[in-house]
Amino acid sequence: QTSVSPSKVILPRGGSVLVTCSTSCDQPKLLGIETPLPKKELLLPGNNRKVYELSNVQEDSQPMCYSNCPDGQSTAKTFLTVYWTPERVELAPLPSWQPVGKNLTLRCQVEGGAPRANLTVVLLRGEKELKREPAVGEPAEVTTTVLVRRDHHGANFSCRTELDLRPQGLELFENTSAPYQLQTFVLPATPPQLVSPRVLEVDTQGTVVCSLDGLFPVSEAQVHLALGDQRLNPTVTYGNDSFSAKASVSVTAEDEGTQRLTCAVILGNQSQETLQTVTIYSFPAPNVILTKPEVSEGTEVTVKCEAHPRAKVTLNGVPAQPLGPRAQLLLKATPEDNGRSFSCSATLEVAGQLIHKNQTRELRVLYGPRLDERDCPGNWTWPENSQQTPMCQAWGNPLPELKCLKDGTFPLPIGESVTVTRDLEGTYLCRARSTQGEVTRKVTVNVLSPRYEGGSGGSGLNDIFEAQKIEWHEENLYFQ
């Protein structure tokens, strides 16, 4: 009778094992082991027992002990079971961004690993088991479907193998794949809203706003704003599930014409885009040309208005005849024209919009000086000791300087409140002077005062003065 010990062995792949072959007869003709494995016999006393070291055990094997005894031949098998953890445990690659609501198939592939009967494949989200199946096939493949939800954003999915050798007195061997981090997103089907001027003038700045609602996660959304080839640099403001991107756009003469304004929102592996056309135009203000901005009264003045070749102008409210970019008017400058504004309004149609530009020039008419009865009365009669304000207004441009002098030496305080004394009486020569010339006007001031009649105790001086036509003024004595 042949026996083997141990009859069952579980060992790691590539490992070694001692196998003892025994026989029941004392003097066996033959005692040995049959195995393809490398073997080494360990010498022991006696003839009925042999110990072999079997090494580099790579796969399950059934070495067989045999003996030839006088009563016959017999054999005994030992069962070597090799265990090893899988060489590859991995999740099939997936795009990191997944839209919410999509069915996501997780596929785990396991290569190697034994004994397969003890090998299980587990699919996990975080630590939560999604599916557990025995490893079947080579490679073994386990799949599960997940409906992508918002709250899956940032979740880690992984695959784990469990080689459970605890019933054989060993431990539980686990192998885990590299995690797959899921990024979930919501990008609405509606395109972004783009608000911008339809027309934009050369050398000006416009504001472009691009916005979109219903995004998740909004902070991950990328916004690209561009006008033609010009990338804009927006300032982005985020809401809970919305954003608003605001950018300033400057345009130059090179941009003139129709340009495409684009706003693209990229989230995950999807994008939404809105296109709009912006017409960039050049429209300088019309030019108002006066033959001379400052002219003397009576001068012929030509006022011209010139604008963009495609514009239509009106000069002081009168449309050009024929309707077009030029208008002019002729006038003879009068004092009433001083300070008169000549306004040219030009209208240009750009992409269906009417653009208006204005330019105003003022005409200065030099005239005067003037002194007339209405504004500088020639005669004043005032009671003595009353408060009066002599008024005399000189007209002209530039405004004349006015001085009223009696005898070239006594000024009349024009526009000042004065106490009327006999001193004030007399004829004043009012002179208005400016760069345009000089005019004079005589102004007489009469002072009403009761005459001294003389009488007892009187000096009689008044009689002498009256007779000689001499008047006494408080400060001056002179002949009338």
């Epitope: 001085k403 070239g408 400060e475 001056n476």
Partner: antibody, heavy 117, light 110 residues
Framework: QSVEESGGGLVKPGGTLTLTCTVS????????MGWVRQAPGKGLEYIGI?????RTYYASWAKGRFTISKTSTTVDLKITSPTTEDTATYFC??????????????WGPGTLVTVSS | AYDMTQTPASVEVAVGGTVTIKCQAS??????LSWYQKKPGQRPKFLIY???KLASGVPSRFEGSGSGTEFTLTISGAQSDDAATYYC????????????FGGGTEVVVK
Amino acid sequence: QSVEESGGGLVKPGGTLTLTCTVSGFSLSSHAMGWVRQAPGKGLEYIGIIGSSDRTYYASWAKGRFTISKTSTTVDLKITSPTTEDTATYFCVRDPYDSYDDGYRLWGPGTLVTVSS
Amino acid sequence: AYDMTQTPASVEVAVGGTVTIKCQASQSIYRYLSWYQKKPGQRPKFLIYDASKLASGVPSRFEGSGSGTEFTLTISGAQSDDAATYYCQQAYSSGSIDNAFGGGTEVVVK
């Protein structure tokens, strides 16, 4: 347009001296003319004025001692019985009371009168 | 009488400094006031008329102000050439007055 004084020099106290102001480039019929003096180390002192109508006006201290008169092109200042106090530079000035700016107010260069025995 | 009182009699100023000269009339002369600059051996130079109007060719650093009885001449950013005696003159009344001119203010520029 210019004004120039003449007639200054040495005069004995109690004598008589007449200074003449000759004008050119304007008419005396439309301008007032005045006389101002400055004694050595003293300030400007107003003497009097003759108006465009030939009327005369004097400082209170000058009445009776000074007489201003004019012809078509000259204005005279007569000093009666001068004293050493009257030693000064005498200036003739056009329109001293007119406040127009004619580029500058016309003053003569002045003439020095020395009263000494 | 329209007597003119000028203060101070003398003032010292550094180049670039500011000088203020005051002139007071004994009764209102409205705005009829002129200012003169007088240097030894030279005729008076007309600076300001009607209290605040600058005569032709006068630098803008000279400024006149006031009306009625109180008047001021201000020299801002004084220059060495501004060293002179300055006089105010009332141009309102020519009769029965002691002097149409103020007593003068000597300006020394250091």
